[in-house]
């Protein structure tokens, strides 16, 4: 007789989820010569029992503690970079500027990007068909809580000047409600950090318009400033040559506006 | 608010060197392109080159070529501007100065105070 | 490399009236250019950029226009502050010239 079985309003976890945290953390740690010591299957084994027979809707920060102590890992803290809605550009940034680092660019980051993940209560199976959205179900999720686990460290080791790539297309560039605006932006530890400088990545080629004067960035600001973090803004006008000017700044056309 | 704080005027021998530095107080530095203008008493204004301080990227005047070294220190937001073989002609008041951007847009928004350096034997 | 050239070298006007400065590129530098005010003793303080964008700060009263080879930074009613060295700037071409500046005095 087939088990009824929860019915969640987001995607089931994602296909072959073992086989994946299991290959990417066997090619991260070979091409990261500072995390070769890391136990791959260890690592899965604490990935698993995280979320692994507990209900998708009560998971905490403590479930995923075990996966944090085998994924610690230093990152240079003044070489960290954020990003809110927009994180094709700060991967591509980061994979040309390769002393900066994105949270996916760190072991666990790298992990779990992409990825969705559910089990079910007081059973070992993974659930494939649906997991819980974290608007339409609940927040406590095994993939939110994960997110907002490594989000929280991530921004608690950053120090000195802390970047963040914004997206300037969408209605609310700095948004209070996503990762970066309720998690990473309140774990920023002042005696640590100097200035949080944002950029503002621009959409369209002929917008020239101050972005850096957007109501939402200088609530940003705002929030930042009553942290005692200095607040820094820029507008990445035109975020295809900002890209090849990292690659190749001796580049003509960076040595030149033509 | 974000400063250029320069370093205080020096007297020099000519054939000697110069470096003055440029630090960046209260902001930040790396991903901005640092200029160096000079302008000697009663003159115009002149650009030496540039550094991007997270690229480590120099550019230089072809009439500076080879006299003039520009370095930056990120961990201390720090930009130097080394002259050699310094000449009387030298004689000038040198500014640092930085762009917003170092790919797009390279107007300079932000000026230091100004190093005085006398060439002079 | 591009030369910048601006007139005239001295403009002497009364506090109140406008002041109306040149500068012309030896070539085209698109609308890569930015006007810098400079008084005795004092740090190049940025004005216009892209011709014709005041920076932050900048009073109304200053505005710039032109593109190509052709541009105008106009000074709508003079205050007594306002008188000082003028340079243009093209960011357009390595290496980036300045115009020779233009003075602007009290009548």
């Known amino acids: 007789v087939p088990r009824w079985r929860q019915q969640w309003s987001g995607p089931g976890t994602t296909k072959r989820f073992p086989e994946t945290v299991l290959a990417r953390c066997v090619k991260y740690t070979e091409i990261h010569p500072e995390m070769r010591h890391v136990d791959c299957q260890s690592v899965w084994d604490a990935f698993k029992g995280a979320f692994i027979s507990k209900h998708p809707c009560n998971i905490t920060e403590e479930d995923y503690q075990p996966l944090m102590k085998l994924g610690t890992q230093t990152v240079p803290c003044n070489k960290i970079l954020l990003w809110s809605r927009i994180k094709d550009l700060a991967h591509q940034f980061t994979q040309v500027q390769r002393d900066m680092f994105t949270l996916e660019d760190t072991l666990l980051g790298y992990l779990a990007d992409d990825l969705t993940w559910c089990g079910e209560f007081n059973t070992s199976k993974i659930n494939y068909q649906s997991c819980p959205d974290w608007r339409k179900d609940c927040s406590n999720n095994p993939v939110s809580v994960f997110w907002k686990t490594v989000s929280r460290r991530f921004a608690e080791a950053a120090c000195d000047v802390v970047h963040v790539m914004l997206n300037g297309s969408r209605s609310k560039i700095f948004d209070k409600n996503s990762t970066f605006g309720s998690v990473e932006v309140h774990n920023l530890q002042p005696e640590k950090v100097q200035t949080l400088e944002a950029w503002v990545i621009h959409g369209g080629r002929e917008d020239s318009r101050d972005l850096c004067q957007d109501p939402t960035i200088k609530e940003l600001e705002s929030i930042i400033s009553k942290r005692n973090i200095q607040f820094s803004c820029k507008n990445i006008y035109r975020p295809d040559k900002f890209l090849q000017c990292v690659k190749n700044p001796e580049d003509s056309s960076c040595t030149s506006e033509i | 608010q974000v400063q250029l704080v320069q370093s205080g005027a020096e007297v020099k021998k000519p054939g000697s060197s110069v470096k003055v530095s440029c630090k960046a107080s209260?902001?930040?530095?790396?991903?901005?392109?640092i200029s160096w203008v000079r302008q000697a008493p009663g003159q115009g204004l002149e650009w030496m080159g540039r550094i991007i301080p997270s690229l480590g990227a120099t550019h230089y005047a072809q009439k500076f070529q080879g006299r003039v070294t520009i370095t930056a220190d990120e961990s201390t937001s720090t930009a130097y501007m080394e002259l050699s073989s310094l000449r009387s002609e030298d004689t000038a008041v040198y500014y640092c100065?930085?762009?917003?951007?170092?790919?797009?847009?390279?107007?300079?928004?932000?000026w230091g105070q100004g190093t005085l350096v006398t060439v002079s034997s | 490399e591009i030369v910048m050239t601006q007139s005239p070298a001295t403009l002497s006007v009364s506090p109140g009236e406008r002041a109306t400065l040149s500068c012309r590129a030896s070539?085209?530098?698109?609308?890569?250019l930015a006007w810098y005010q400079q008084k005795p003793g004092q740090a190049p303080r940025l004005l216009i950029y892209g011709a014709s964008t005041r920076a932050t700060g900048i009073p109304a009263r200053f505005s710039g226009s032109g593109s190509g080879t052709e541009f105008t930074l106009t000074i709508s009613s003079l205050q007594s502050e306002d008188f000082a060295v003028y340079y243009c700037?093209?960011?357009?071409?390595?290496?980036?010239?300045f115009g020779q500046g233009t003075k602007v005095e009290i009548k």
């Open positions: 100065a930085r762009s917003d951007s170092f790919y797009y847009a390279y107007y300079m928004d932000l």
């Open positions: 070539q085209s530098v698109s609308s890569n």
């Open positions: 209260g902001g930040v530095f790396s991903y901005y392109t």
């Open positions: 700037q093209q960011y357009n071409n390595w290496p980036w010239t």
